[in-house]
């Protein structure tokens, strides 16, 4: 004699997060009398998803009219699916009684949820580093499912190979996170460079997500200094310039010292920008030679981005014999870099 069968035709169903999942279930008979119930999971800890007889299930709707005479389709639609909804769903026929008793269960339908990874967030080192140094960048993305995911690193379009990636957790989970650390060697030309973390996942339909970090936030290019003496501007005056070249970021303070004594301090303002993103700046000092009896040591001292000062000196030779009207002061450039 034929007995009621509970048919769940789909072994598995995959749904994108935010969409609705339709779980199919039909029975072959209207007897015995009693409700259909849907559960997630099996055993005593199973979770009730829907009960035809009673209860309020705001996310669940029946696909066909459950009150319709002769209805044998107990498929349900679950709205606004999240990764937490993943699991195996069982359609179970109960027999009317006091209490209702489980009569027969379907084979189950495994619901997997495709959840997009969050936008990758790339973060660099806390402190700036100078060219030739290796710095680490991290990339994180969360909340994706299934677990399979691909992560790539690029610097200015060139794929990087020195990185390590972990996907957590290792075991089964409703959703996963990825964490990757890449090592990047800085060069002086990296002010305009970008490091890109690219994440590809089945939910993204071939359009990967990217997170970027600008190396301008990471790099510090120290300046080169050059002190030169210009031709005499006026009687007894010498113009000495300090060329500060190829520095980044712009934060820079320059101090002129005359024989070790502070003459003037200024902050870089009207800088010029180079093609590579670094800056140049020039400061000059007018030295009244007649005010000096002895040779003058001029020092251009630069403090860049809070780092220890870098300096370059220039010696002005003041002649021992009395000066003649309009005569040039002999000056010799014996500059040296001092730190």
């Amino acid at each position: 004699e034929e007995e009621l069968q509970v048919i769940q035709p789909d072994k598995s169903v995959s749904v994108a997060a935010g969409e609705s999942a339709i779980l199919h279930c039909t029975v072959t008979s209207l007897i015995p009398v009693g409700p259909i119930q849907w559960f997630r999971g099996a055993g005593p800890a199973r979770e009730l998803i829907y009960n035809q007889k009673e209860g309020h299930f705001p996310r669940v709707t029946t696909v066909s009219e459950s009150t319709k005479r002769e209805n044998m389709d107990f498929s349900i639609s679950i709205s606004n699916i999240t990764p937490a909804d993943a699991g195996t769903y069982y359609c179970v026929k109960f027999r009317k009684g006091s209490p209702d008793t489980e009569f027969k269960s379907g084979a189950g339908t495994e619901l997997s949820v495709r959840a997009k990874p969050s936008a990758p967030v790339v973060s660099g080192p806390a402190a700036r580093a100078t060219p030739q140094h290796t710095v680490s960048f991290t990339c994180e993305s969360h909340g994706f499912s299934p677990r399979d995911i691909t992560l790539k690193w690029f610097k200015n379009g060139n794929e990087l190979s020195d990185f390590q990636t972990n996907v957590d957790p290792v075991g089964e989970s409703v959703s996963y996170s990825i964490h990757s650390t890449a090592k990047v060697v800085l060069t002086r030309e990296d002010v305009h460079s970008q490091v890109i973390c690219e994440v590809a996942h089945v939910t993204l339909q071939g359009d990967p997500l990217r997170g970027t970090a600008n190396l301008s936030e990471t790099i510090r290019v120290p300046p080169t200094l050059e002190v030169t003496q210009q031709p005499v501007r006026a009687e007894n005056q010498v113009n000495v310039t300090c060329q500060v070249r190829k520095f980044y970021p712009q934060r820079l303070q320059l101090t002129w010292l005359e024989n070790g004594n502070v003459s003037r301090t200024e902050t870089a303002s009207t800088v010029t920008e180079n093609k590579d993103g670094t800056y140049n700046w020039m400061s000059w000092l007018l030295v009244n030679v007649s005010a000096h009896r002895d040779d003058v040591k001029l020092t251009c001292q630069v403090e860049h981005d809070g780092q220890p000062a870098v300096s370059k000196s220039h010696d002005l030779k003041v002649s021992a014999h009395p000066k003649e009207q309009g005569s040039n002061t002999a000056a010799e450039n014996t500059g040296s870099n001092e730190r």
Epitope: S29, L30, P32, V33, G34, S98
Partner: antibody
Framework: RSVEESGGRLVTPGTPLTLTCTVS????????ISWVRQAPGKGLEYIGT?????ITYFASWAKGRFTGSKTSTTVDLKITSPTTEDTATYFC????????????WGPGTLVTVSS | ALVMTQTPASVSAAVGGTVTTKCQAS????????LAWYQHKPGQPPKLLIY???TLATGVPSRFSGSGSGTQFTLTITGVQSDDAATYYC???????????FGGGTEVVVK
């Protein structure tokens, strides 16, 4: 879809009587058949439902007084030992209540129990 | 066991009028909605009108409606027609599958 009763007749008390419900247009493997009776001048009275072997049940007052069986297209209701109180028109109907209500019904068959 | 008490036993209504019959269960019916209404005319089989307390059976005119839950149920005929003269029965289902009980019936006379 239809059901029709047969087998109603005059019997003496204690003489077993079998009523048959013949169905067409639906399968007995997916529908129960319920029996209801109406004694002269009285209201409707539910007797029981015959489904598959394990799913056959009778109202508490009817247990032991009736048995049920079925074939692929017929359902039998046996009155095991009729008494005069069993005189009634007997109806069979497709369905087993709750979300499977009794519908359609047969025209009924009259059983008279008299000595 | 479930007991279904149906009132009134008889009611008279004019064509176009409204008729209500009530059914009270001795305990909550199964699922709070295991209640059907049947129309029975002499010499004919009963006819299903309403099931699951308020669901109109196929082909039944919309002037018939059912309401209620738990223990109290009502059948309403709005705009009574002469063809509605009949006896109306409620059928309640208890928690056990064999616990199906008819009410005593309400005879509707149409003037």
């Amino acid at each position: 879809r239809s059901v029709e009763e047969s087998g109603g007749r005059l019997v003496t008390p204690g003489t077993p009587l079998t009523l048959t419900c013949t169905v067409s247009g639906f399968s007995l493997s997916s529908h129960g058949i319920s029996w209801v009776r109406q004694a002269p001048g009285k209201g409707l009275e539910y007797i029981g439902t015959i489904g598959t072997g394990v799913i056959t049940y009778f109202a508490s007052w009817a247990k032991g007084r009736f048995t049920g069986s079925k074939t692929s297209t017929t359902v039998d209701l046996k009155i095991t030992s009729p008494t005069t109180e069993d005189t009634a028109t007997y109806f069979c109907a497709r369905g087993s209540a709750w979300n499977d209500p009794f519908d359609p019904w047969g025209p009924g068959t009259l059983v008279t129990v008299s000595s | 066991a479930l007991v279904m008490t149906q009132t009134p036993a008889s009611v008279s209504a004019a064509v176009g009028g409204t008729v209500t019959t009530k059914c009270q269960a001795s305990q909550s019916v199964y699922g709070n909605n295991d209640l059907a209404w049947y129309q029975h005319k002499p010499g004919q089989p009963p006819k299903l009108l309403i099931y699951l307390a308020s669901t109109l059976a196929t082909g039944v005119p919309s002037r018939f409606s059912g309401s209620g839950s738990g223990t109290q149920f009502t059948l309403t005929i709005t705009g009574v027609q002469s063809d509605d003269a009949a006896t109306y029965y409620c059928l309640g289902g208890g928690d056990d599958e064999a616990d199906n009980v008819f009410g005593g019936g309400t005879e509707v006379v149409v003037k």
